[in-house]
């Protein structure tokens, strides 16, 4: 009789990323007998939950169940029924919920409580919903990209998995941009740190890593825009804000009450002689860049070197993977190519921002104006954050790789989170087994 491979024992895991602007559900799978190997876990599905982030459900907690239904049902379809009960489900909430918790711990707890009750109704092994720290978000993002790039593997390969993978074991730094926070995580050259708050020590697959990480709350792209508007309206002479970060001809009325809803604008809050103001775009990259820089306080640094706002940042080291909104925005602007220099990116941003709003609407007709209008700001903000915030230069720009997926898995903190919670990243290098995993009968 013909030899047949026994059916592989496959395991699954689910992680929900409850971000500030939306929630995504990720389904991962891996061969059970290889779960301590590096690089065997991969994403089989991403389901984007329709609607805003869970923090917006603070007045609508009764709808959280409906909100999560479609993606949880999708998970039920994708994962074989026989595996449901042993499939762990984790929900991690990030900066949107950190901000809600700052406003009201009670309200944040209420949202998480309803989320937990909703997720407990499914046949999976629900492991809890929690607000992860900014440090965790940075660390797990770093673990994810290096796991997917094969940086933890001790086996040297003669081939590269992805175009920008060098065959050495030097880890990539991680740059993550969300709607409400941004994270920078990397292994600095100098192992000693001036700021213990920003230091993490890992032992992964038999190797020690001393990692620097920081999460800047309120410096995600959406909250940064609110900050900028709140800062600029302070000095406006009337209820018209001529804004260089929006295209010429763009007009939008903003309620002052909406501007001051977020804790991120508290430092700029003042009594204004109007309830509404109108943004009038003038589309000037250079002026927009200058306005954004005013969000970064670089006048104070109690360390040898800082990013901004007095936060320690060691000298940058090695290559970096820039993902989440870093990727989404730059991909929209068609600026993710490895061949595009920082000077060229700046030049293209100048051109993009100066394009009349009517022209932009025609060029990108399928995109809702609400989102389309913000790409000039977002692109400018990314450049400002990377260059002035994190001190990348025209030369070191070439070490930034804008990454959406690696080997079919999204770059982001969720995979690293699951690998950690399922104990799939051993501290020591697993002993290699003499026999192959396939068994034939």
């Amino acid at each position: 009789t013909q030899n047949k491979a026994l059916p592989e024992n496959i395991k699954y895991g689910i992680v929900l990323d409850a971000g500030s602007s939306h929630t995504s559900l990720y389904i991962y799978k891996w061969p059970a007998e290889k779960e301590n190997d590096t690089g065997v876990v991969h994403q089989v599905e991403e389901c984007r939950v329709k609607g805003p982030g869970i923090s917006k459900y603070v007045q609508k907690v009764n709808e959280i169940g409906i909100y999560l239904t479609d993606c949880m049902e999708r998970a039920r379809e994708v994962i074989p029924r026989s595996q449901h009960q042993e499939t762990p489900v984790y929900l991690g909430a990030t900066a949107g919920m950190r901000l809600l918790r700052m406003e009201s711990e009670e309200l944040a707890d209420r949202v998480l409580d309803v989320v937990e009750r909703s997720l407990s109704n499914y046949p999976f092994d629900f492991q809890g919903a929690r607000i992860i720290t900014g440090q965790e978000e940075g660390a797990y993002g770093w673990i994810t990209i290096n796991y997917l790039l094969g940086k933890f593997s001790q086996k040297t390969r003669w081939f590269s998995i992805v175009p920008y993978e060098t065959n050495n074991q030097e880890t990539f730094g991680a740059l993550d941009l969300g709607g409400a926070s941004t994270q920078i995580t990397f292994v600095p050259q100098n192992q000693t740190t001036e700021s213990p708050d920003n230091a993490l020590q890992f032992r992964l697959y038999g190797k020690d890593y001393n990692v620097y990480t920081h999460s800047f709350l309120c410096y995600g792209k959406d909250q940064a825009l609110w900050q900028k508007l709140a800062k600029d309206i302070q000095v406006a002479s009337n209820e018209i804000l001529r804004d260089p970060c929006f295209h010429p001809g763009y007009k939008k009325v903003v309620n002052v009450s909406d501007l001051y809803k977020t804790p991120c604008t508290k430092r700029f809050e003042m009594t204004l002689p109007f309830q509404q103001f109108e943004i009038q775009g003038i589309g000037n990259y250079q002026q927009c860049h200058q306005s954004v820089l005013e969000l970064f306080n670089t006048s104070y640094c109690p360390y040898s070197q800082c990013a901004f706002n007095g936060i320690f940042l060691p000298p940058l080291q090695g290559d970096f993977g820039a993902f989440s909104a870093f990727y989404f925005v730059m991909n929209f602007l068609n600026l993710t190519s490895e061949k595009v220099s920082q000077e060229k990116v700046t030049e293209m941003m100048k051109k993009f921002c100066s394009q009349p709003w009517e022209e932009i609407k025609t060029s990108y007709a399928g995109v809702k104006e609400k989102y389309l209008s913000e790409y000039c700001f977002s692109g400018t903000y990314i450049l400002s954050l990377l260059l002035q915030g994190y001190h990348f230069t025209a030369d070191s720009w070439e070490h930034i790789h804008f990454i959406g997926k690696i080997q079919g898995s999204d770059a982001g903190w969720t995979l690293g989170y699951m690998l950690n919670l399922t104990n799939m990243i051993p501290a020591e290098q697993p002993l290699s087994t003499p026999l192959s995993h396939s068994t034939y009968v």
Epitope: R48, G51, D258, T362, A365
Partner: antibody, heavy 124, light 112 residues
Amino acid sequence: QVQLQQPGTELVMPGASVTLSCKASGYSFISYWMHWVKQRPGQGLEWIGEIDPSDDYTNYNQNFKGKATLTVDRSSSTAYMQLNSLTSEDSAVYYCAREENGIYYYNKGYLDVWGTGTTVTVSS
Amino acid sequence: DIVMTQTAFSNPVTLGTSASISCRSSKSLLHSNGITYLYWYLQKPGQSPQVLIYQMSNLASGVPDRFSCSGSGTDFTLRITRVEAEDVGFYYCAQNLELPYTFGGGTKLEMK
């Protein structure tokens, strides 16, 4: 099932204002944009504007700027449209309609669920 | 604003035969991304409108495959094969390429 419930009729005096309601049920209210459409007797459809119930972001047809104001009450899953300085030209059926935009939240979609419509009659 | 033009009436149709309803836009609705931002809605007598077709070629959920749409960037035709009694009403084409979204004046489909 998904429903958008609107009152049947509103009789208002010329020059007055009226606020039309649209109560959503059977889905997550803040997950879908809401649109308002006008239909005058025996005539076609005219788009008034749209609102994102998650954050009150609005877009209006220029023809209705100053005439219509779109708002939502998230706690009751209700969308509202206030019409002011009413004249006989405003006598019409007004529909609210939900926008379905597929998996990409940033893309424009189509109006997949329509309300029952409110007939507004402006008369002294 | 983009103007959508429809003829007010179609030729009366016999049950079980085919019907065609045309629509013209004042500007091409075919975008460089390959999507045509043209939609069809049906308003049956005494009812609210309902979507039939989105982005020119996609059938909305629950709509029978008797309905189809073809066209260039500016000229569109809605075809109904094997017309049924429940298909009577006003057919509206619409665009959402640009704000404000605009509708055609509607075409009344009647039975012989």
